[in-house]
């Protein structure tokens, strides 16, 4: 029976006389007056079984004591680590001639577990053991013992095991502790692959190549290989696993992501949170669902925040001229978190009696640039009928419209072609400029051509290069624009309304909102 | 078994000589040392010193040099103590002693029954 | 030469009960003393060498321990046998031995 004692995890013991319960049992020759098995205490007041011999006053001394039969558990090179003690001859008096300090060690090997007698010429020789001149004193009981310690390696192994003997010559000397191991390189994980218990190879010198698994939840990337080396070490880890998607490595392992986390490929990378307007239920998600009314366009990416279609245009303005259209408008107010917005025109003949039966323009009208996809705010459609009633739709759409299409994405204006529409406006004047403010008044077109229903003012900081305007619409001749930065240079443009439709925009007065009030009168160019 | 065998009791007269023998058996003679103890009647045990069997090499504690030697005859495994010019002191028992030297320490581990001498005129 | 003194000179005990006797060195002894004990009319035995270690045959009863000049024989619980004298042995610088411990029956 062995009791448990710790050594490295790159040690597999086969034999330690410290570990044994009782007796030892070991074969001496002779059997009296050699090795003599003894029970010693140490520092714990456990028994030691040692044996010793200190056969010092004869001459030719020739002791042997050899161990039980020990399995080589596959291993083709062993080692075997003695402590021992040994008296100083000096120590003993009177013994000069006789008294040796060293021992030697022998090991043969064999199939048969139950080999009776030492029959010495079996045997090879390790070594001869000598006491190093640096020992480690133990407690043994309340005196301090003085310990040697000597390692020793044999090899290669081929029978299913061998025997150890210890050949005494004439030394003082107690074996305290006999230990037999082999190396191994133990069970690790390496870059997600486990590579198993190995037993080293035969030369001190060698290279066992192993072949890694891949852990579970990982795949392949290179072949997972290392090599074993003979001191029970691992060397020169070569390729890998990754984990699967949906697993992310933690402590060596392929762990599924956790609730509100994913990870679409197997790399080597964590799992990352679900992308704005997503979210995951399950464990090991390898992408995460949108939210309601949230879509994934098909090239979109896993990481890619989930996005809805955008809001409708704005400020949609028109402008007939015979039978041609040109339509103006701003971007939505909401892109839907996308970058890839663009504009569809759709058109549409209504009858003059019934403006609610409309049928497609068809494919006589031309659009330009085009009539889909279009990256402008902006489109001129020609060869319409004259005297026809028209309906005008621009849809915003972006990568994820088709998914969930609806009239709150589109803005319409209807119009007649072929009815004059009125002239410009030739002086548009500023009547009073504040800090926040402009005072526009300006005279009616030179031909009205029916009667103006309305007028409307497009403006827009300078800077911004009509990107970004504002329309106000009035039945007076004048207005008051409010909300406006100081010192900041604006562009007016104004332009009459009948029933057929809109007239060209004036010329554009270009105004700089003041520090201090003042009365500026413009004269339909540059006001400063 | 291992044992050692000492000679039954001797009355000397002052003066005389007296030789205890002490003959060894069931172990090598040659392979331990050979210690004399005395106990003087009612005392404790006093060391008087050893001989290499091997050797025949005395080593005499203090107090037992001159009137004391220790001799051997190897082929009969035996140890003597020869004890001259006798004085009344000298009346004790004489134990022979085989001496265990081991690497945790020595001791005298085989006795022999002990010889009785006494002196008195 | 080194001096032994052994104490008490006489241990008065009942079987069953523990026993612990004294040896102390004039100067140190290292681990090198033994114990022995003898029954009237009988010669020595050997029962402790290297000041701890059970010579062969001894009872697990007798335990010692001590190093350098103060040294204890223990008998854990004391049987009839064991009435006898005890004595204490160097071997660090020639031998000598102490005047003896006597236990008795109490």
């Known amino acids: 029976v062995t009791g448990s004692r710790v050594y490295p995890a790159n040690e597999v013991t086969l034999l330690d006389s410290r570990s044994v319960q009782g007796e030892l049992g070991w074969i001496a020759s002779p059997l009296e007056g050699g090795w003599e098995e003894v029970s010693i205490m140490d520092e714990k007041n456990t028994p030691i079984r040692t044996y010793q011999v200190c056969n010092v006053m004869e001459a030719s001394q020739n002791n042997w004591l050899r161990t039980d039969w020990i399995t080589r558990e596959g291993a083709q090179r062993v080692y075997i680590e003695i402590k021992f003690t040994l008296r100083d001859c000096n120590s003993l008096p009177g013994v000069m001639g006789t008294c040796k300090e060293t021992f030697n060690l022998y090991y043969y090997e064999s199939d048969n577990d139950k080999e009776r007698f030492i029959r010495e010429s079996q045997f090879g020789k390790i070594d001869t053991i000598a006491a190093d001149e640096s020992f480690t004193q133990v407690d043994i009981g309340d005196r301090i013992m003085k310990l040697n310690t000597e390692i020793r390696d044999v090899g290669p192994l081929s029978k299913k095991g061998f025997y150890l003997a210890f050949q005494d010559v004439g030394a003082c000397i107690a074996l305290v502790s006999v230990r037999v191991f082999y190396k191994k390189c133990p069970l690790t994980v390496r870059n997600l692959a486990q590579f198993p218990d190995t037993i080293t190879g035969a030369d001190t010198s060698s290279l066992v190549e192993v072949r890694g698994s891949c852990v579970n939840n990982s795949e392949e990337k290179d072949v997972p290989k290392m090599y074993c080396g003979a001191d029970g070490e691992w060397l020169v880890p070569i390729g890998n696993c990754l984990c699967n998607a949906g697993h992310e490595e933690q402590n060596g392992e392929c762990q599924a992501c956790k609730i509100g986390y994913y990870k679409a490929l197997s790399t080597d990378a964590s799992c990352a949170k679900c992308p704005p307007h997503s979210y995951s239920v399950w464990e090991g998600a390898t992408s995460c669902t949108c939210d309601r009314g949230f879509f994934r366009a098909d090239n979109d990416a896993a990481s890619m925040p989930c996005t809805r279609p955008p809001s409708a245009p704005l400020n949609l303005i028109s402008n007939v001229n015979e039978t041609s259209v040109n339509l103006e408008w701003s971007s939505p107010q909401n892109t839907g978190g996308r970058q890839d917005i663009s504009y569809n025109v759709v058109c549409k003949k209504c009858g003059a009696g019934d403006p609610s039966k409309c049928r497609p323009c068809g494919s006589g009208v031309h659009y330009t640039p085009q009539q889909n996809g279009l990256k402008t705010t902006r489109v001129s459609i020609t060869d319409l009928l004259a005297h026809t009633n028209y309906t005008f739709e621009i849809w915003a759409v972006n990568g994820v419209s088709k998914y969930n299409p609806s009239p709150d994405q589109s803005v319409s204006v209807t119009v007649t072609t072929n009815q004059a529409a009125p002239s410009s406006i030739a002086l548009v004047q500023a009547k009073e400029v504040t800090r926040y403010s402009v005072a526009l008044a300006w005279l009616e077109p030179d031909r009205p051509n029916g009667v103006i229903l309305e007028y409307e003012v497009k403006y827009y900081e300078k800077d911004q290069n009509e990107r970004s305007y504002r329309i106000v619409r009035t039945a007076a001749r004048n207005t008051d624009i409010k909300g406006l930065n100081p010192l900041t240079s604006y562009v007016f443009h104004v332009r009459a309304r009948t029933a057929a439709g809109y007239g060209d925009f004036s010329e554009p007065l270009e105004v700089t909102t003041n520090t201090v009030p003042s009365r500026i009168i413009g004269d339909g160019a540059n006001s400063t | 078994q291992v044992q050692l065998l000492q000679s039954g009791a001797e009355v000397k007269k002052p003066g005389a000589s007296v030789k205890v023998p002490c003959k060894a058996s069931g172990y090598t003679f040659t392979s331990y040392a050979m210690s004399w103890v005395r106990q003087a009647p009612g005392q404790g045990l006093e060391w008087m010193g050893w001989?290499?069997?091997?050797?025949?090499?005395?080593t005499y504690a203090q107090g037992f040099t001159g009137r004391f030697v220790f001799s051997l005859d190897t082929s009969v495994s035996t140890a003597y103590l020869q004890i001259s010019s006798l004085k009344a002191e000298d009346t004790a028992v004489y134990y022979c002693?085989?001496?265990?030297?081991?690497?945790?320490?020595?001791?005298?581990?085989?006795w022999g029954q002990g010889t009785l001498v006494t002196v008195s005129s | 030469e080194i001096v032994l003194t052994q104490s008490p000179a006489t241990l008065s005990v009942s079987p069953g009960e523990r026993a612990t006797l004294s040896c102390r060195a004039s100067q140190s002894v290292s681990s090198n003393l033994a114990w022995y004990q003898q029954k009237p009319g009988q010669a020595p035995r050997l029962l402790i060498y290297g000041a701890s270690t059970r010579a062969t045959g001894i009872p697990d009863r007798f335990s010692a321990s001590g190093s350098g000049t103060d040294f204890t024989l223990t008998i854990s619980r004391v049987e009839p046998e064991d009435f006898a004298v005890y004595y204490c042995?160097?071997?660090?610088?020639?031998?000598?031995f102490g005047q003896g411990t006597k236990v008795e029956i109490k």
């Open positions: 002693a085989r001496v265990r030297l081991t690497v945790y320490g020595d001791g005298m581990d085989v």
């Open positions: 042995q160097q071997y660090g610088s020639s031998w000598t």
């Open positions: 001989i290499n069997t091997n050797t025949g090499n005395p």
